[in-house]
């Protein structure tokens, strides 16, 4: 039942073209071409670009023309392979073109890198952007895609062309407005913040597909669609899960033309269909494209049907359990999965994971043994330490998030991760806690029936940005571990380790702990950032340091940068008070 | 609109064969167990047998191998196939919907039912 | 497989009535176990699941209650719509249902 065109075309390039439109198609290669060559200049992209694009018109003309009945991979790999500086600036990554296609694709993916070696995005004057917007416009909106999918390779394309489109708005809106920046740079903060969790989440179900395979994602997808389509039988479940792996596995393998035509196409069968979906669709179903799709994407869950019964009947207390599962055992898990996420839209969609997984475990056992039915009885019983697991972890951090406001909360975690994982490298601690941390101010807000779903599917999100920031440089065999083991079990395993104790404590290094005046300037999240900078310092040389002792140093530290951000001579201050508040801290920690 | 409606019933010989057909608007078969049950005039209930979303079927002991229930997922139906019929097969015969895939009740949604009346 | 017994098999009563019917499981069915109503002509309508769920649209006069193996269907105050035939409905305990042999409500 796939919404899905099968028809064959005769030029695939001609075929995306038609479909998505000449302004769709050219954001889509830059996207793709940014995302692969992420050191690239702007300009050479843009030139690439325009060769596609101009190949495609051909065939749109004329099917039959050369070289356009080749598949897309060729075409664009081609073109990349063009690039004259590709050894130079990539290195092993120019060993690519040597392969013939569909290696040479995943030998592209393959090299894509979540952290690339690029300068941060320094936010030009108001004004500054203002004249660059009315002086070439789709300039300046080229190079917001460049920019964002060159630093986020796994960037969800379709959606980056509906931040595009809000960004173009912002411009256009506020660059007439009489106060711009007033307009502009709360637009662009919530683009900004946005954009960078979008990113994180569909890093994490790209890391599904590459990682866990084509199963586990469905998975995942039946869990959700059930929980916020609860009213929608399995099999509609089934179809928007086979459709849905569809285009997510597209955009995951690079194949953005093809992902951006699949997800209209499944915005527009769910909009055709909504009566037998979901109540809560209407008004997304009214919107353009891009902005149908993103709501669709971000959808309240509806309300769940009056009359469903309980699930131990046919899951548990039936003697024919065994029967089903054996002859249909998909069948049987999916619907299992499927009712159960229904009935519990309170529960995180990994907690329905591992209860689902739970589930399939005693079966496989269970149906082996002597009396099947008296072994699997009391299952059900086996899902209550599991799913009060993550509800006393959230109770006792929301607790805590109240009590500390989240800095504090964000150091909090900054200690204990980095006693559990002190091989990390700091920038990565202190970005992966921070994340952390803005769980707090994220779920602690919502009510009991909506905390874990925010909170625990939040954590799965920034838990893989750890993993695919370690897995480029491997140093902690603890978080490989807690990474590849089982993707529904990372958190648990994250919260289950201990301090390491075999770590040997990093070298005392005054420098690491030598301030200057330039962080008075300094934003109060980049003022944050350095002092968080610290305290994972300091815990990596004294990781047996109490809480207390930590506070101390920490709010010793807070009182020096302010005494010094307000002297007359702040070079000074922080020269010889640095030295001061050094020999002190090493004093309070016994270094 | 969700219905059920069945067809197929009418007047068979002893010892004939008759197919009853289900068919479901509104709603995906496939996603559901579906059941058969009968009615003799002025007597209970009777369950038949059911078809789960996983294609196996279960049937009352007194049904197994007379009876058999199968479907057709394309064309949205699902089916009674009755052999060697008996005076005491006289019934309306329902069909019902299961509450999940795998449900052998409780029944929300039933057709009309088709009377069979089996006399020579 | 499991038999359920309702009695009474036919009752008389007056608009207004509280009616108590109940349902017997030779075996524990747990709480897997349904009410339904039917009238001449028409197929049976759910009134309860679960033994004491009461199914969305049905008057809140309706009642059910039991576990194990007694279970009982109970009408607080009778209306002129409520006669009817009432049957009880096993599940759960294995692919396969039974039902009770129904209950003839009629007008005192």
């Known amino acids: 039942r796939g919404v899905f065109r099968r028809d064959a075309h005769k030029s695939e390039v001609a075929h995306r073209f038609k479909d998505l439109g000449e302004e769709n198609f050219k954001a889509l290669v830059l996207i793709a071409f940014a995302q692969y060559l992420q050191q690239c200049p702007f300009e050479d992209h843009v030139k690439l670009v325009n060769e596609v694009t101009e190949f495609a018109k051909t065939c749109v003309a004329d099917e039959s023309a050369e070289n356009c009945d080749k598949s897309l991979h060729t075409l664009f790999g081609d073109k990349l392979c063009t690039v004259a500086t590709l050894r130079e600036t990539y290195g092993e990554m120019a060993d690519c073109c040597a392969k013939q296609e569909p290696e040479r694709n995943e030998c592209f993916l393959q090299h894509k890198d979540d952290n690339p070696n690029l300068p941060r995005l320094v936010r030009p004057e108001v004004d500054v952007m203002c004249t660059a917007f009315h002086d070439n416009e789709e300039t300046f909106l080229k190079k917001y895609l460049y920019e964002i999918a060159r630093r986020h390779p796994y960037f969800y394309a379709p959606e980056l062309l509906f931040f595009a489109k809000r960004y173009k708005a912002a411009f256009t809106e506020c660059c007439q407005a009489a106060d711009k920046a007033a307009c502009l740079l709360p637009k662009l903060d919530e683009l900004r913040d946005e954009g960078k969790a979008s990113s994180a989440k569909q890093r994490l179900k790209c890391a599904s597909l590459q990682k866990f395979g084509e199963r586990a994602f469905k998975a995942w997808a039946v869990a959700r669609l059930s929980q916020r389509f609860p009213k929608a039988e399995f099999a509609e479940v089934s179809k928007l899960v086979t459709d849905l792996t569809k285009v997510h596995t597209e955009c995951c393998h690079g194949d953005l033309l093809e992902c951006a035509d699949d997800r209209a196409d499944l915005a527009k069968y769910i909009c055709e269909n909504q009566d037998s979906i979901s109540s809560k669709l209407k008004e997304c179903c009214e919107k353009p494209l891009l902005e149908k799709s993103h709501c669709i994407a971000e959808v309240e869950n509806d309300e769940m049907p009056a009359d469903l019964p309980s699930l131990a009947a046919d899951f548990v207390e039936s003697k024919d359990v065994c029967k089903n599962y054996a002859e249909a055992k998909d069948v049987f898990l999916g619907m299992f999965l499927y009712e159960y996420a229904r009935r519990h839209p309170d529960y995180s969609v990994v907690l329905l994971l591992r209860l689902a997984k739970t589930y399939e475990t005693t079966l496989e056992k269970c149906c082996a043994a002597a009396d099947p039915h008296e072994c699997y009885a009391k299952v059900f019983d086996e899902f209550k330490p599991l799913v009060e697991e993550p509800q006393n972890l959230i109770k006792q951090n929301c607790e805590l998030f109240e009590q500390l406001g989240e800095y504090k909360f964000q150091n909090a975690l900054l200690v204990r991760y980095t006693k559990k994982v002190p091989q990390v490298s700091t920038p990565t601690l202190v970005e992966v806690s921070r994340n952390l941390g803005k769980v707090g101010s994220k779920c602690c807000k919502h009510p009991e029936a909506k905390r874990m779903p925010c909170a625990e599917d939040y954590l799965s999100v920034v838990l893989n940005q750890l993993c695919v920031l370690h897995e480029k440089t491997p140093v902690s065999d603890r978080v490989t571990k807690c990474c590849t083991e089982s993707l529904v079990n990372r958190r648990p395993c994250f919260s289950a380790l201990e301090v390491d104790e075999t770590y040997v404590p990093k070298e005392f290094n005054a420098e690491t702990f030598t301030f200057h005046a330039d962080i008075c300037t300094l934003s109060e999240k980049e003022r944050q950032i350095k002092k968080q900078t610290a305290l994972v310092e300091l815990v990596k040389h004294k990781p047996k340091a109490t809480k207390e002792q930590l506070k101390a140093v920490m709010d010793d530290f807070a009182a020096f940068v302010e005494k010094c951000c307000k002297a007359d001579d702040k070079e000074t201050c922080f020269a010889e008070e640095g030295k001061k508040l050094v020999a002190a801290s090493q004093a309070a920690l016994g270094l | 609109e969700v219905q059920l409606v069945e067809s197929g019933g009418g007047l068979v010989q002893p010892g004939g064969s008759l197919r009853l057909s289900c068919a479901a608007s509104?709603?995906?078969?496939?996603?559901?167990?579906m059941n058969w049950v009968r009615q003799a005039p002025g007597k209970c209930l009777e369950w038949i047998g059911h078809?789960?979303?996983?294609?196996?079927?279960y049937y009352a002991t007194w049904a197994k191998g007379r009876f058999t229930i199968s479907r057709d997922n394309s064309k949205n139906t699902v089916y009674l196939q009755m052999n060697s019929l008996r005076a005491e097969d006289t019934a309306v015969y329902f069909c019902?919907?299961?509450?999940?895939?795998?449900?052998?009740?409780?029944?929300?949604?039933w057709g009309q039912g088709t009377l069979v009346t089996v006399s020579s | 497989a499991f038999e359920l017994t309702q009695s009474p098999s036919s009752l008389s009563a007056s608009v207004g009535d509280r009616v108590t019917i109940t349902c017997q499981a030779s075996?524990?069915?747990?709480?897997?176990l349904a009410w339904y109503q039917q009238k001449p002509g028409q197929p049976p309508k759910l009134l309860i699941y679960?033994?004491?769920d009461l199914t969305s649209g049905v008057p809140s006069r309706f009642s059910g209650s039991g576990s194990g193996t007694d279970f009982t269907l109970t009408i607080s105050s009778l209306q002129p719509e409520d006669f009817a035939t009432y049957y009880c409905q096993g599940y759960g305990g294995s692919s396969t249902t039974t039902f009770g042999c129904g209950t003839k409500l009629t007008v005192l």
């Open positions: 075996e524990s069915i747990n709480s897997r």
């Open positions: 679960d033994a004491s």
């Open positions: 019902a919907r299961g509450a999940g895939g795998f449900s052998t009740g409780p029944f929300k949604l």
């Open positions: 078809i789960n979303a996983g294609d196996i079927a």
């Open positions: 509104g709603f995906s078969l496939s996603s559901y167990a």
